[in-house]
C-alpha cells in the first residue's frame, strides 16, 4: 500500500472506482455502471453520471415545460447509452424496445417510437436557462455581487469558462443563469454547459458529485444563498420534433 494509492481518487466524481493500474502505474478511475475511464481533472459527462446513478437507482422526478421549444427533463431518470467519449447516443431505447431521440444533455426531443426510429445526429443543446428561487432574505442581493459570485462558482467549482455564462438575471426572489455554448465555441478541454448544469443541479439538491467535498455553500457578500426550487430549461440548436398531439 503506497502513497500513490492513497492519492488515487477522483476529485470531480465520487461515483468511480480508482486504482494505480494505468499506464506506468498511474492512477486510473472508472465510472460505476459503465466501467469507462474518466478524466478526473474535469467534470464527468452527464451520460456517464446518469449511468452510474442507475446502478443505484432512485425515484424519477418530474419538471415543468413552459414553452414550445424549451425542453425540461420530464422523463426523469433512465439508464442511457453513452458513446465511447461518454456522450449520449442520439437514440435511446428502454428494455421494452421503446426508443426516442435525445439532445446532448440527454433530454428527450421527439415522441417515443419503436426500434425503427431514426435519430440522425446528436442535436446540441446550446442554451440552458437555470431558473432558481431563493429563500427569503433580509433584503435583495446586490445584482452585481450575485452575478460575480455565480460566475466565480461556475468557473471554480464546475470549471466552466466565464464566457459561457451569458447572463445572470435577478428579480427577487428569482435568479436566472443563462449558459450559452455553440458547437463552434466549444474547444477541446472546455467543460460542456450541460455537464456544468447537471453538477449544479445535483449540488443544489444536496447530492454533490464531488469526492469528499462538503455540499455547496453559496454566499453573496457573506449572506447565504439558499435555493428553494430549481427549473432547468434546455434549448437545442435544432428545435425538437414532437407531434401536435403532444402539444395540445
Amino acid at each position: 500500500h503506497t502513497a500513490a494509492q492513497d492519492n488515487c481518487t477522483c476529485p470531480t466524481n465520487k461515483m468511480t472506482v480508482c486504482s494505480p493500474d494505468g499506464p506506468g502505474g498511474r492512477c486510473q478511475c472508472r465510472a460505476l455502471g459503465s466501467g469507462m475511464a474518466v478524466d478526473c481533472s474535469t467534470l464527468t459527462s452527464k451520460c456517464l453520471l446518469l449511468k452510474a446513478r442507475m446502478s443505484a437507482p432512485k425515484n424519477a422526478r418530474t419538471l415543468v415545460r413552459p414553452s414550445e421549444h424549451a425542453l425540461v427533463d420530464n422523463d426523469g431518470l433512465y439508464d442511457p447509452d453513452c458513446d465511447p467519449e461518454g456522450r449520449f447516443k442520439a437514440r435511446q431505447c428502454n428494455q421494452t424496445s421503446v426508443c426516442w431521440c435525445v439532445n446532448s444533455v440527454g433530454v428527450r426531443r421527439t415522441d417515443k417510437g419503436d426500434l425503427s426510429l431514426r435519430c440522425d445526429e446528436l442535436v446540441r443543446t446550446h442554451h440552458i436557462l437555470i431558473d432558481l428561487r431563493h429563500r427569503p432574505t433580509a433584503g435583495a442581493f446586490n445584482h452585481s455581487d450575485l452575478d460575480a459570485e455565480l460566475r466565480r462558482l461556475f468557473r471554480e467549482r464546475y470549471r466552466l469558462h466565464p464566457k459561457f455564462v451569458a447572463a445572470v438575471h435577478y428579480e427577487q426572489p428569482t435568479i436566472q443563469i443563462e449558459l450559452r455554448q455553440n458547437t463552434s465555441q466549444k474547444a477541446a478541454g472546455d467543460v460542456d454547459i450541460g455537464d456544468a448544469a447537471y453538477y449544479f443541479e445535483r449540488d443544489i439538491k444536496g447530492e454533490s458529485l464531488f469526492q469528499g467535498r462538503g455540499g455547496l455553500d453559496l454566499r453573496v457578500r457573506g449572506e447565504p444563498l439558499q435555493v428553494e426550487r430549481t427549473l432547468i430549461y434546455y434549448l437545442d440548436e435544432i428545435p425538437p420534433k414532437f407531434s401536435m398531439k403532444r402539444l395540445t
Partner: antibody
C-alpha cells in the same frame, strides 16, 4: 520532496529535445497538475504546459507552444516535455513545477525544480 | 487576458516598505499567487489565494486584493528580500495566455 529536470543543453536551430522532470519523496499519481515553465535569460516567467497526473492526463498549452511542444506523463514518476523546431528564442531555463490543487484554474506552484538550461545556437 | 505588474523596479532602504501591484485584465476572484525569485534559483511561493501566506514565509509579506486589483506589501525590508517578485494566476489558462506578471525587481539599499 524534490523535483529535478534533465535533458537540457546545446541544441542546433530547428533541432529538437526532450526534457524530463522526476520527483523524489512523492509520486506523480496524485490529483494535481505538473507544469513546465520557462525563463529566457534576464526575462520573466512564462508557462508552457501543465498535465494532470491523476486519472485522465488532461493538458493545456500556451498559445505560442501549441504544435511545437508536447507534454506527457508515461509513468507515475516522470513528466516529459518534447520540443521541436527550436529557435534562438527558445533559449531559456526550463523549470518543472507542481501545482498545489487539482483545479487547473486555481493553481499555484508550491514545488519547483532547479531548472535546466536549454541553449539553441549553431 | 493579461497580468500587468508595476513597478518594474523599486529601491528602498533596509527597514522600509515596498508595495507591488498586479492588475488582471479580467476578474480572477482571489486566484492569485506571489513568488520571490533570486538569481540562479527557481521561484519560491510566498502567497496564494491572494492573501494566504505559504508555509515558512514571514508575516512581513502581505497579500491583498480580489477581482482585478492585487497588492504585495513587504514591510521591515531586509537585505535577503532583494529579489524579483512575480504575480501569477492560472484562471484563464484555457485561453492559452501567460498568467505571470512581468516581474518587479526589488533592490534593498
Amino acid at each position: 520532496q524534490q523535483l529535478e529536470e534533465s535533458g537540457g543543453g546545446l541544441v542546433k536551430p530547428e533541432g529538437s529535445l526532450t526534457l524530463t522532470c522526476k520527483g523524489s519523496g512523492f509520486d506523480f499519481s496524485g490529483t494535481y497538475w505538473m507544469w513546465w515553465v520557462r525563463q529566457a535569460p534576464g526575462k520573466g516567467l512564462e508557462w508552457i504546459a501543465p498535465i494532470y497526473v491523476g486519472s485522465g492526463s488532461s493538458t493545456y498549452y500556451a498559445s505560442w507552444a501549441k504544435g511545437r511542444f508536447t507534454i506527457s506523463s508515461t509513468s507515475s514518476t516522470a513528466v516529459t516535455l518534447q520540443a521541436t523546431s527550436l529557435t534562438a528564442a527558445d533559449t531559456a531555463t526550463y523549470f518543472c513545477a507542481r501545482g498545489a490543487t487539482n483545479n487547473v484554474f486555481m493553481n499555484y506552484f508550491n514545488l519547483w525544480g532547479p531548472g535546466t538550461l536549454v541553449t539553441v545556437s549553431s | 487576458f493579461e497580468m500587468t505588474q508595476t513597478p518594474s523596479s523599486v529601491s528602498e532602504p533596509v527597514g522600509g516598505t515596498v508595495t507591488i501591484k498586479c492588475q488582471a485584465s479580467e476578474d480572477i476572484s482571489s486566484n492569485l499567487g506571489w513568488y520571490q525569485q533570486k538569481p540562479g534559483q527557481p521561484p519560491k511561493l510566498l502567497i496564494y489565494g491572494a492573501s494566504t501566506l505559504a508555509s515558512g514565509v514571514p508575516s512581513r509579506f502581505k497579500g491583498s486584493g480580489s477581482g482585478t486589483e492585487f497588492t504585495l506589501t513587504i514591510s521591515d525590508l531586509e537585505p535577503a528580500d532583494a529579489a524579483t517578485y512575480y504575480c501569477q494566476t492560472s484562471y484563464y489558462i484555457d485561453d492559452g495566455v501567460n498568467g505571470f506578471g512581468g516581474g518587479t525587481e526589488v533592490v534593498v539599499k
